[in-house]
C-alpha cells in the first residue's frame, strides 16, 4: 500500500487514561493465542503525523542503525531508504554493517503515482521497543524512488505486515513477519492501536504525539474496551475481509454485497481513508449528505479535497452520521458491525487557515481496487491480526476519539445469510498485472 | 434576475452596532444550492470576507470579526442581516452582500455596496 | 493561514496589449482559486473559478491557469472596459475567505 490517500493519526476527545479502562468481558480468553495481558514494553510504540502514517522504531545492521519505519499491512516487503534522499534525514548504509548479506537482486515496485526500487539483502533487524529478539530478516535497500518517501513525515522505510503472495519481487521473498515467527518463540499474532490526535496539530505537536501501539506476539488487554469480535481472513495476501452490510446512520444502502466487495475489501494501515468501490462510495455520499443537510458543503469537500473549517471547538459532529461496516463473523450466518463516527472519518489538517479554527478533510474516498479499511476505520479499533487463526478481530479501542453523545461500537451478533456469496472472485489473471498502488 | 440589495444606515457611531439588510428579489434566499454572504472593503483597500449563511440558519464567520459578527436570515422576507457590535472607525467600509454559489464556492453574484462610516 | 500574494500592484499597459496578472498562495490551494474585476463604484465581478473556468458572460480575452501555488490571470488583448482592480480568492479553506491584495491594471 502507499500513501497518497494512503495514511494518518486523529479525531476528538482521548479514551479514558490508563487505569480507567471501562471493564471488558472476558469470554474468549481462553482462545487468544499468544501472550495475553500486558506489553508494556510495547504500548505506545508508534508516532505519526495526521495523513503520513504511523512508525515504529527499529534497528537494522551491526552495530544497529535505527530507522523510523512506516507499519503497513498493505504491503508485503521490508524496505529502508539507502541511499541519501532530499526528504530523509538518515538512511540505511549497508557498507556500515558487518552482518549485511546481498542477495545480488534487484526490485522493482510501481504505485499508481510513483515507484521505489532498490537492491535485495538480508541483514539482522530488532524492534528496540518489541519483542527482545533479533532476526535475520530480508531487506529491500531503496536506492531510487519518486513520489515515496514524504517531507517531514519522519519515516525511512516501510514494513509489509501482510503475506507472501503480495511480495516483490514474487512470493519467494519471505515477510519480515515470517521470518520473526520462523527464527523464535513469538507467536503469529500482532495487533494495532492506531490512536490518531482528534485535532489538528501544529508541527512541534505532532512530532511528540503518540500515535498508538504495535503488540506482537498477543493481545494487549489495555488497549480495548469490551470484546473482541472476529471475522475470518478470507485470503492470505492482504489482510481480505468481507463486509456483508453497509449502513449510514443506522439506514442500510441496500446494496448486493458484492459490491462492498468489488474486488476486495482489505483492512491496511499504509492507507488514510476509507476508501470505498465507486458505487459504493456515490451511494454513501449520497446518505451522508443526506443526513448532514442542515449544512452543505462543496463538492470538493466530498471529493477529499478542500477543506471545511470551523471555529476551534465548535465542529458540528452531531450533524454526521455515523458509518458502520458489518463483516461476517466467524460462526455461520453470523456477522457483527463496526461502527465509526465523524470524528475518525473527518481528518484534522494541521496549518492552514488560523488557530482560532479546526479545519477538515472527508476522509471517506473513491476506489478502484475495492474497499480499503484505512486508519480512518482502524483509529476506532483496536485491530488483531490473528495469522494463527486465520482472522482478523476488532474491538472499541481505548484510545478512540468520540464525544458525550456517540462512541465508536463493535457490536454482534448479528444473522445474515449467505455472507459467502458477498466475496468477489477475482479473475484469474499473470499475478504481474495486480495492481500494486493504492492512490 | 436575482437580484441582492445592502440597506441600512450610512453612519454608525463607534461603539454601537452596524445593522444591515441584503434583500433577495428575483429569486429564493431559501435555495439549497446558494450559502449568502457578507464581504467589506475599506476605503482604497483590498476585500474582507465577514462571513456566510445558508438559509437553514448555519453561519461561518471570518476568524479576525467572529467575536463581533452575527448574521441571520429571515426565509419568509428573503432577507440576511449583518450585525457588527462595538464598531470603531476601523470598520469604515463599503459593505457588499452577495451569493455564494458554483457548488457554494465562489461569490458569484453581488450587491452594489453600502457605504458605513463609523464616526461621532 | 494561505496568504495570497497578488503582482505586481500596478500594471500599465496600453489598449491591445497583453496583461499578465499573477497571484501566489504561500501554500498549494490546488485548483481553488477564482479572480474578480472590479471597476471603481462598483461591486467586485466574478471572472474566472476554479483557476481556468470563465463564469457565465465573461468574455474569451479573459483566461485564468495554473495550479498548486502559482495562478495567473491573462488577457490577451486589453480592452478600454478591462482597466480596472483584480483580486484572486482562494476556497480550497472552506469556507472562502482569502483574498489577495490585487493587482491594478492602468492605461499607460
Known amino acids: 500500500t502507499h500513501l497518497g490517500i494512503r495514511l494518518p493519526l486523529r479525531s476528538g476527545l482521548a479514551g479514558p487514561p490508563l487505569g480507567l479502562r471501562l471493564p471488558r468481558e472476558t469470554d474468549e480468553e481462553s482462545e487468544e493465542p499468544g501472550r495475553r495481558g500486558s506489553f508494556v514494553e510495547m504500548v505506545d510504540n508508534l508516532r505519526g503525523k495526521s495523513g503520513q502514517g504511523y512508525y515504529v522504531e527499529m534497528t537494522v545492521g551491526s552495530p544497529p542503525q535505527t530507522l523510523n519505519i512506516l507499519v503497513d499491512t498493505g504491503s508485503s516487503n521490508f524496505a529502508v531508504g539507502a541511499a541519501p534522499h532530499p526528504f530523509l534525514h538518515r538512511y540505511y548504509q549497508r557498507q556500515l554493517s558487518s552482518t549485511y548479506r546481498d542477495l545480488r537482486k534487484g526490485v522493482y515496485v510501481p504505485y499508481t503515482q510513483g515507484k521505489w526500487e532498490g537492491e535485495l539483502g538480508t541483514d539482522l533487524v530488532s524492534i528496540p521497543h518489541g519483542p527482545n529478539v533479533t532476526v535475520r530478516a530480508n531487506i529491500a535497500a531503496i536506492t531510487e524512488s519518486d513520489k515515496f518517501f514524504i517531507n517531514g513525515s519522519n519515516w525511512e522505510g516501510i514494513l509489509g505486515l501482510a503475506y507472501a503472495e503480495i511480495a516483490r519481487p514474487d512470493d519467494s521473498l519471505e515477510p519480515f513477519f515470517d521470518s520473526l515467527v520462523k527464527q523464535t518463540h513469538i507467536p503469529n499474532i500482532f495487533s494495532l492501536q492506531l490512536c490518531g490526535a482528534g485535532f489538528p496539530l501544529n508541527q512541534t505537536e505532532a512530532l511528540a504525539s503518540v500515535g498508538g501501539s504495535m503488540i506482537i506476539g498477543g493481545i494487549d488487554h489495555s488497549l480495548y474496551t469490551g470484546r473482541l469480535w472476529y471475522t475470518p481472513i478470507r485470503r492470505e495476501w492482504y489482510y481480505e475481509v468481507i463486509i456483508v452490510r453497509v449502513e449510514i446512520n443506522g439506514q442500510d444502502l441496500k446494496m448486493d454485497c458484492k459490491e462492498y466487495n468489488y474486488d476486495k475489501s482489505i483492512v491496511d494501515s499504509g492507507t488514510t481513508n476509507l476508501r470505498l468501490p465507486k458505487k459504493v462510495f456515490e451511494a454513501a455520499v449520497k446518505s451522508i449528505k443526506a443526513a448532514s443537510s442542515t449544512e452543505k458543503f462543496p463538492d470538493g469537500f466530498w471529493l477529499g479535497e478542500q477543506l471545511v473549517c470551523w471555529q476551534a471547538g465548535t465542529t458540528p459532529w452531531n450533524i454526521f452520521p455515523v458509518i458502520s461496516l458489518y463483516l461476517m463473523g466467524e460462526v455461520t450466518n453470523q456477522s457483527f458491525r463496526i461502527t465509526i463516527l465523524p470524528q475518525q472519518y473527518l481528518r484534522p489538517v494541521e496549518d492552514v487557515a488560523t488557530s482560532q479554527d479546526d479545519c477538515y478533510k472527508f476522509a471517506v474516498s473513491q476506489s478502484s481496487t475495492g474497499t480499503v479499511m484505512g486508519a480512518v476505520i482502524m483509529e476506532g479499533f483496536y485491530v488483531v491480526f490473528d495469522r494463527a487463526r486465520k482472522r482478523i478481530g476488532f474491538a472499541v479501542s481505548a484510545c478512540h476519539v468520540h464525544d458525550e453523545f456517540r462512541t465508536a461500537a463493535v457490536e454482534g451478533p448479528f444473522v445474515t445469510a449467505d455472507m459467502e456469496d458477498c466475496g468477489y472472485n477475482i479473475p484469474q489473471t499473470d499475478e504481474s498485472t495486480l495492481m500494486t498502488g493504492r492512490a | 434576475q436575482l437580484q441582492l440589495q445592502e440597506s441600512g444606515p450610512g453612519l454608525v457611531k463607534p461603539s454601537e452596532t452596524l445593522s444591515l439588510t441584503c434583500t433577495v428579489s428575483?429569486?429564493?434566499?431559501?435555495?439549497?444550492?446558494?450559502?449568502w454572504g457578507w464581504i467589506r472593503q475599506p476605503p482604497g483597500k483590498g476585500l474582507e470576507w465577514i462571513g456566510n449563511?445558508?438559509?437553514?440558519?448555519?453561519?461561518y464567520y471570518n476568524p479576525s470579526l467572529r467575536s463581533r459578527v452575527t448574521i441571520s436570515v429571515d426565509t419568509s422576507k428573503n432577507q440576511f442581516f449583518l450585525k457588527l457590535s462595538s464598531v470603531t472607525a476601523a470598520d469604515t467600509a463599503v459593505y457588499y452582500c452577495?451569493?455564494?454559489?458554483?457548488?457554494?464556492?465562489?461569490?458569484?453574484?453581488w450587491g452594489r455596496g453600502t457605504l458605513v462610516t463609523v464616526s461621532s | 493561514e494561505i496568504v495570497l500574494t497578488q503582482s505586481p500592484a500596478t500594471l500599465s499597459l496600453s489598449p491591445g496589449e497583453r496583461a499578465t496578472l499573477s497571484c501566489r498562495a504561500s501554500?498549494?490551494?490546488?485548483?481553488?482559486l477564482a479572480w474578480f474585476q472590479q471597476k471603481p463604484g462598483q461591486a467586485p465581478r466574478l471572472l474566472i473559478y476554479?483557476?481556468?473556468n470563465r463564469a457565465t458572460g465573461i468574455p474569451a480575452r479573459f483566461s485564468g491557469s495554473g495550479s498548486g501555488t502559482d495562478f495567473t490571470l491573462t488577457i490577451s488583448s486589453l480592452e478600454p472596459e478591462d482597466f480596472a482592480v483584480y483580486y484572486c480568492?482562494?476556497?480550497?479553506?472552506?469556507?472562502?475567505?482569502?483574498f489577495g491584495g490585487g493587482t491594478k491594471v492602468e492605461i499607460k
Open positions: 449563511i445558508y438559509y437553514s440558519g448555519s453561519t
Open positions: 501554500q498549494s490551494v490546488s485548483s481553488y
Open positions: 480568492q482562494q476556497v480550497y479553506v472552506w469556507p472562502p475567505r482569502t
Open positions: 476554479d483557476a481556468s
Open positions: 428575483g429569486g429564493s434566499i431559501s435555495s439549497s444550492s446558494y450559502y
Open positions: 452577495a451569493r455564494l454559489g458554483h457548488g457554494y464556492n465562489y461569490f458569484d453574484l
